[in-house]
Interface confidence: low
């Protein structure tokens, strides 16, 4: 990088005329356009590949140009370049007449040109000015030029850059000879490579700044020595990245199927015994005196309706006591002093004599029970609904309203989405609370194992630079574990110029 400097010194246009020979009115208000470009044996139009610069109006007809700012323009004129100076150049200097204040090319008539000079040749970098003078029939231009290096550039071609910096492109200061000296924590030819946190795993970690430890895909922890389980893994661990090895009592591809509800949730109350009966399913066996799906309800001794023949039950500290209606006696009012002649059967019950009329029995119509058909049948008393189903009396019958996931007259059947064998190609079906999941055999994928895939994503050796390849069996994709000094999804990038990582 450097600057081509052009010092305009004197312009002579004694007759005050344009290139066409036409005189300027009132005089030639002269400004210059400069085009610097690559060497051409014959200088021709085309891009000013090294740069362009224009001056303001510097004078009228003939004038000398001062060595400092003049009307807002600089002298010498600066044409900076940001490449290695090739040592050769072409230079076009045009003198133009400005009738008005607008100096833009499109604002000037094409015949406003006063003169045009074009030179080409060799030019070495240096402090010394080359003086030149170009004369045409009507004008003369005296000028000098040179090429110097920009600050922080050195060498015959201004190609040796050394500028202290502390950014993405390097972290160094410059030595007197232009060589680099790395800042603490940085290494490498251009001091771009950070020295990572001590102990950072050399395969699984890397860093973008000193004393840092960033983990490659599949690894975590302060030193990147802990693997990351598969995305979605709930109750599982890994020994290499993207595994999901289930903890005790859990199952399924993501270890999210509870195979031990009893242990994990202890749902049975009041000392009941819990038995696992499938995924998220259990049965509580209640101790005497308790009832309910989770044995959460304490039974009253009267709850079992021990008093017969319309006797009323009273709870007592040491048990219960039956108050018998007229005509009955006994602990449970089970003995009668009545006969069929006393019409003891209620609610349309039929009376049948027994023991030669000393006793009787009532035959009750549907929906009634008891020795005298005095009780309306409550078909829910015996808690016939399994798996937490709710019992409902419906006239002469009862029905069970089942919890989600259960069916059958008594909610005794677990609803199975797997019953219709939805998993293709020998996939294993798992019932979930809200549906099902297929675990596919090797070589198949998709929600129902319907997609045939390659069995081993690593078979094609997709990883570069001797990286280790892991196959993610749940998605049939691969993960590359890069050796030290390489990054990227396939370990294709050297760490020296880290790309922007997608993780």
């Amino acid at each position: 990088s450097g600057v081509f400097q052009l010092q305009l010194q004197e312009f002579i246009n004694e007759r005050g005329v344009l290139a066409s020979g036409r005189p300027c009115e009132p005089g030639c208000r002269t400004f210059f356009r400069v085009c610097l470009k690559h060497f051409q044996a014959v200088v021709s139009p085309g891009p000013c590949t090294f740069g362009t610069v224009s001056t303001p109006v510097l004078g009228t007809n003939s004038f000398a140009v001062r060595d400092d700012s003049s009307g807002g323009g600089r002298n010498p004129l600066q044409l900076p370049f940001n490449f290695t100076w090739p040592g050769t150049f072409s230079l076009i200097i045009e003198a133009w007449h400005a009738p008005g204040d607008d100096l833009r090319p499109e604002a000037l008539p094409p015949d406003a040109l006063i003169s045009k000079i074009a030179i080409q040749g060799s030019l070495a970098v240096g402090q010394n000015w080359l003086l030149d003078e170009q004369t045409s029939t009507l004008t003369r231009l005296r000028y000098s030029y040179r090429v110097i290096c920009s600050d922080n550039y050195y060498g015959d071609n201004c190609s040796r850059l050394c500028k202290k910096r502390n950014d993405h492109f390097g972290h160094y200061v410059c030595q007197p000879d232009g060589n680099l000296s790395c800042l603490p924590g940085w290494t490498g030819e251009y001091c771009q490579q950070p020295i990572c946190l001590s102990g950072c795993h050399e395969q699984n970690g890397y860093c973008s700044k000193p004393a840092e430890c960033l983990c490659r895909p599949g690894w975590q922890g302060r030193l990147c020595n802990e693997c990351i389980p598969h995305n979605g893994c709930r109750h599982g661990t890994c020994s290499t990245p993207w595994q999901c090895t289930c903890d005790e009592g859990w199952g399924g591809l993501f270890c999210d199927q509870d195979l031990n509800y009893c242990t994990h949730h202890s749902p049975c109350k009041n000392g009941a015994t819990c038995s696992n009966s499938g995924q998220r399913s259990y049965t509580c066996t209640c101790r005497p005196g308790y009832t309910g799906v989770d044995c959460e309800l304490e039974l009253s001794e009267c709850d079992s309706n021990p008093c017969r023949n319309g006797g009323s039950c009273k709870d007592q500290e040491d048990g219960y006591h039956c108050l018998c209606p007229p005509g009955y006696y006994g602990l449970h009012c089970e003995h009668s002093t009545l006969s069929c002649a006393d019409s003891p059967c209620f609610n349309g019950g039929s009376c049948r004599e027994r023991n030669q009329g000393a006793n009787y029995a009532c035959e009750c119509p549907p929906n009634f029970t008891g020795s005298n058909c005095e009780k309306k049948v409550d078909r829910c008393t015996s808690n016939p609904c399994a798996n937490g189903g709710q019992c409902l009396n419906r006239g002469p019958s009862r029905m069970c309203r089942c919890r989600p996931g259960f069916t059958g007259t008594y909610c005794e059947l677990h609803v199975s989405d797997c019953a219709r064998n939805p998993c293709a190609h020998g996939g294993t079906c798992h019932d979930l609370e809200n549906g099902l999941m297929c675990t596919c055999p090797a070589g198949f994928s998709g929600r129902r194992c319907e997609v045939r895939t390659s069995i081993d994503a690593c078979a094609s050796s997709p990883c570069f630079n001797r990286a280790t390849c892991y196959t993610d069996l749940s998605t049939d994709t691969f993960v590359c574990n890069c050796p030290y000094g390489f990054v990227g999804s396939r370990c294709e990038f050297p760490v020296g110029l880290p790309p922007s990582f997608p993780w």
């Epitope: 690559h38 051409q40 021709s44 139009p45 085309g46 891009p47 000013c48 590949t49 362009t52 490449f83 090319p105 499109e106 094409p110």
Partner: antibody
């Protein structure tokens, strides 16, 4: 909008000349140059040269230097490209495209003119 | 003359895929002088990218140009059906101005 409209297809015999026109509209014609590019199945896209509508200066590719002439008519905002001593390998679609010295690209392009050279 | 070599010659991809086209110059080219064009059958080329990385007016932001020196890249982040075409790079730093031989992006 900026538009370049070219003349129609031409069929020529070897040794003849062809002159293709390119009518510009939608911008100040003299602020830009016109480049000519041809496309042959064998050679792909090939730049032939350009002309400044501002001052008429031209820059021809050396390959065509001795048999090409580019001109402009600022009054009708039209550019012309004449190619002489035609050969069969000059069969191509010839495009004009707007170009400016400080914008180093071609935009827009004309629709193209097919020139067929055949005996 | 500067030779621009484009690779690959043909790219077979599906809609939604990412396309990466390369243009390598036989010698260093200032980025300001490198452009990319798209051409569909029976049509003139259309400017996509100028100055190596600037999108032309009306060009969607899925088109990105990058690079400097001798290596330049055109990236199409997600291919749309209308993007299947031939793409050319072009330099105007040194005369004669030259084009690459083109990369055809076709539907797989």
């Amino acid at each position: 909008q900026v538009q370049l409209v070219q003349s129609g297809p031409e069929v020529k015999k070897p040794g003849a000349s062809v002159k293709v026109s390119c009518k510009a509209s939608g911008y100040t014609f003299t602020y830009y140059g016109i480049s000519w590019i041809r496309q042959t199945p064998g050679q792909g896209l090939e730049w032939m040269g350009w002309i400044s509508a501002y001052d008429g200066n031209t820059d021809y590719a050396q390959k065509f230097q001795d048999r090409i002439t580019m001109t402009t008519d600022t009054s009708s905002t039209t550019a012309y490209m004449e190619l002489r001593s035609l050969r069969s390998d000059d069969t191509a679609v010839y495009y004009c495209a707007r170009y400016s010295w400080n914008k180093h690209w071609f935009d827009p392009w004309g629709q193209g003119t097919l020139v067929t050279v055949s005996s | 003359e500067i030779v621009l070599t484009q690779s690959p010659g043909t790219l077979s991809l599906s809609p939604g895929d990412r396309a990466t086209l390369s243009c390598r110059a036989s010698q260093s080219v200032t980025g300001s002088y490198l452009a990319w064009y798209q051409q569909k059958p029976g049509q003139a080329p259309r400017l996509l990218i100028y100055g190596a990385s600037n999108r032309a007016t009306g060009i969607p932001d899925r088109f990105t140009g990058s690079g400097s020196g001798t290596d330049f890249t055109l990236t199409i982040s997600r291919l749309e059906p209308e993007d299947f075409a031939v793409y050319f790079c072009q330099q105007s730093a040194f005369s004669p101005w030259t084009f690459g031989q083109g990369t055809k992006v076709e539907i797989k």
